[in-house]
Amino acid sequence: QSPPGKPEIHKCRSPDKETFTCWWNPGTDGGLPTNYSLTYSKEGEKTTYECPDYKTSGPNSCFFSKQYTSIWKIYIITVNATNQMGSSSSDPLYVDVTYIVEPEPPRNLTLEVKQLKDKKTYLWVKWSPPTITDVKTGWFTMEYEIRLKPEEAEEWEIHFTGHQTQFKVFDLYPGQKYLVQTRCKPDHGYWSRWSQESSVEMPNDFTLKD
């Protein structure tokens, strides 16, 4: 039996700059029941607070609701482990909510097969930003990627679309069913998960790719 090992805050994420969650790895428990608490202070303040919500985001986590989240302040967060033999603390982690945003995937992915005047066919891919994202006001600047592949293929073909919420894909194989997904990333944050797949079958009635 021994004091607990040092815990580690291994991830903090916000879906929208309005709430966020931090998760920790407990470390060894020293063979004894061990209690974990997350404490934090904010830049320029001496007061230390305890995690407002240990439940919402699951085990070994702390959820900060709107009431406790500010993008104007740095959070200095520590996890403390305590058992009968002693205690240990994680290294403090400095969290700027601007830099931990991982949004929901884009919505309303639509696929349309179109034809140019010269009979060249292309796939027009369109989507909407995630619901929670206030892109119009500049609160978020979002970048996007799409990926697509023939249904049976292993490898995805990825296209970065910048800030555009639509993209035209040329030179696809006729008669093939294609799977398409999209994802987004805010200016300083992390890529979202890929959206659910949408599929489309390219028509047969145009010239085959070389």
Epitope: E8, H10, I71, L93, D96, Y99, H188
Partner: antibody, heavy 118, light 112 residues
């Protein structure tokens, strides 16, 4: 505790390339971006670029595009920077540095001195 | 790129005196989120830099309170209220509001 280990020095010939390593320990490697910074002898610091080890997404200082390539090996928790077509201007100390979830550098490697000499 | 101009290049001081280092940016360092990402680092010979102050005025963990930062917009100052022997090192300001992140040229604090 968080540690970033870098080799002390590399001596390389002009026109060749070098791959610098930065082995991370004491934290979850894929959770934090890794930056690279250049310091020429007796001079200031220059930010080269950053890589997100979770998906290898990179962002470079325009000045170093084509010169530096950032990669990671998540299984060994190691970040790499490949420098190509080396000239005397590339002789410098190169640091890897990690922020927290913030945009400053909390942890630094000890730096690798790259000397480009015939 | 944002140019960070530090003055003076070298600052002779007596132990116990106050030292003041200035840093000026070529454009405003106020981020679109309202924060100002101006930081100060200290570097000892043969070592990597260490963070002293983040976001203009916040002392990093373990930094003595004789170090303080101030300023806004494009003009910033690092003050050391009572210089000690261990403070006679190289200081850099740095901005991370705009990509690429940039650094000042450095100020060497030395004994008068």
């Amino acid at each position: 505790q968080v540690q970033l280990q870098q080799p002390g020095a590399e001596l390389v010939r002009p026109g060749t390339s070098v791959k610098l390593s930065c082995k991370a320990s004491g934290y979850t490697f894929t959770s934090f971006w890794m930056h690279w910074v250049k310091q020429r002898p007796g001079q200031g610091l220059e930010w080269i670029g950053v890589i997100d080890p979770s998906d290898s997404h990179t962002n470079y200082n325009q000045k170093f595009k084509g010169k530096a390539t950032l990669t990671v090996n998540t299984s060994s928790s190691t970040a790499y920077m490949h420098l190509s077509s080396l000239t005397s201007e590339d002789s410098a100390v190169y640091y890897c540095a990690r922020g927290d979830y913030s945009n400053w550098f909390t942890y630094w490697g000890q730096g690798t001195l790259v000397t480009v000499s015939a | 790129d944002v140019v960070m101009t530090q003055t003076p290049f070298s600052l002779p001081v007596s132990l116990g005196d106050q030292a003041s280092i200035s840093c000026r940016s070529s454009q405003s360092l106020v981020h679109s989120n309202g924060n100002t990402y101006l930081h100060w680092y200290l570097q000892k010979p043969g070592q990597s830099p260490k963070l002293l102050i983040y976001k203009v005025s916040n002392r990093f963990s373990g930094v003595p309170d004789r170090f303080s930062g101030s300023g806004s917009g494009t003009d910033f100052t690092l003050k050391i209220s009572r210089v000690e022997a261990e403070d006679l090192e190289l200081y850099f300001c740095s901005q991370s509001t705009h990509v690429p992140w940039t650094f000042g040229g450095g100020t060497k604090l030395e004994i008068k």
